[in-house]
């Protein structure tokens, strides 16, 4: 089961954009929806990297805890290598159109691949979108 039963945690007022895929399939602007963050997941995340087995570009957006934003093994959750994690502290700040702009209150971490955070992200159901 999931590490966090997110549905049982209270909404915390933060809204972040959520998606999994790449910039054209799964994480395009049209496929990226706002979700309500819950519990301690009070930052908005963008994680980019390459995805096994074909080394294709891959991206994840969603809500995250501060520790997830700094997690050296975040890439393992999605079989991602050369992962770059960017988190920010305003609702909606991980909008796709802001990727090339400064993202307010953001901080970045760069890691090489690969511990078990996938359950947390799986619990951020895209169906929760606004």
């Amino acid at each position: 089961g999931p590490i966090l039963e997110l549905e049982n945690l209270p909404q915390n007022g933060r809204q972040c954009y959520s998606c999994k895929g790449n910039s054209t399939h799964g994480c395009s602007s049209e496929e990226t929806f706002l979700i309500d963050c819950r519990g301690p997941m009070n930052q908005c995340l963008v994680a980019t990297g390459t995805h096994e087995p074909k080394n294709q570009s891959y991206m994840v957006r969603g809500c995250a805890t501060a520790s997830m934003c700094q997690h050296a093994h975040l890439g393992d959750a999605f079989s991602m290598n050369h992962i770059d994690v960017s988190c920010c502290t305003k609702s909606g700040c991980n909008h796709p159109d802001l990727d090339v702009q400064y993202r307010g209150g953001s901080h970045h971490h760069h890691h090489h691949g690969g511990s078990g955070l996938n359950d947390i992200f799986e619990a951020q159901k895209i169906e929760w979108h606004e």
Epitope: Q11, N12, G13, R14, S91, G92, D97, Q101, G105
Partner: antibody, heavy 118, light 107 residues
């Protein structure tokens, strides 16, 4: 539950000032941009400006420069709108809203009616 | 400052009728957001990022557009849809101007 609770209605004299409050519950105001929006009787919505409570940065619509001052107190999770040199044109309902990074206002207070009358 | 013009200002529709209202911007904007307001109440979030429905908004609502031309459509009018709808633009910087509103009445 996310809520924005605004202060009560105000009846003020022309030339006076008034300070409205907007208190958030269910979220930290530092997570949002707190916006203020004006609606005159039977009229549309006008964006006054916003504050980033995290650092005190503000932005105003040009027509409200000098008329409106937006402040925030993060310790009480409250934002304020002060209106100065009031005239009948300032008679309106004023809404506070929680706005996100792309100008979307998902959270709205119930509004405060300000009536300027001698 | 970007000016938004909504049309028509007032319209009426019968139950089951398709409804389309438009919002025209004086210069290109990135996205259009929409709000619904009923008399005596605060505006409610309705659509964001041009085409995405806010939580609780019925699927009969849709939004589309780009550049300077945007629209909100109701595929089949219902009595509860009678309200005033405001568009509001987002480009990279404030001010976040609103349109003048379209008042939708039920026939």
């Amino acid at each position: 539950e996310v809520q924005l609770q605004q202060s009560g209605a105000e009846l003020v004299r022309p030339g006076a000032s008034v300070k409205l409050s907007c208190t958030a519950s269910g979220f930290n105001i530092k997570d949002e941009y707190i916006n203020w929006v004006k609606q005159r009787p039977e009229q549309g919505l006008e964006w006054i400006g916003w504050i980033d409570p995290e650092n005190g940065d503000t932005e105003y619509a040009s027509k409200f420069q000098g008329k409106a001052t937006i402040t925030a107190d993060t310790s009480s999770n409250t934002a304020y709108l002060q209106l100065s040199s009031l005239t009948s044109e300032d008679t309106a309902v004023y809404y506070c809203t929680g706005g996100n990074y792309v100008g979307w206002f998902p959270y709205w207070g119930q509004g405060t009616l300000v009536t300027v009358s001698a | 400052q970007i000016v938004l013009t909504q049309s028509p200002a007032i319209m009426s529709a019968s139950p089951g009728e398709k409804v389309t209202m438009t919002c025209s911007a004086s210069s290109s904007v990135s996205y259009m957001h929409w709000y619904q307001q009923k008399s005596g109440t605060s505006p409610k979030r309705w659509l964001y990022d041009t085409s995405k429905l806010a939580s609780g908004v019925p699927a009969r609502f849709s939004g589309s557009g780009s550049g300077t031309s945007y629209s909100l459509t109701i595929s089949s009018m219902e009595a509860e849809d009678a309200a005033t709808y405001y568009c509001q633009q987002w480009s990279s910087n404030p001010p976040y101007t609103f349109g003048g509103g379209t008042k939708l009445e039920i026939k």
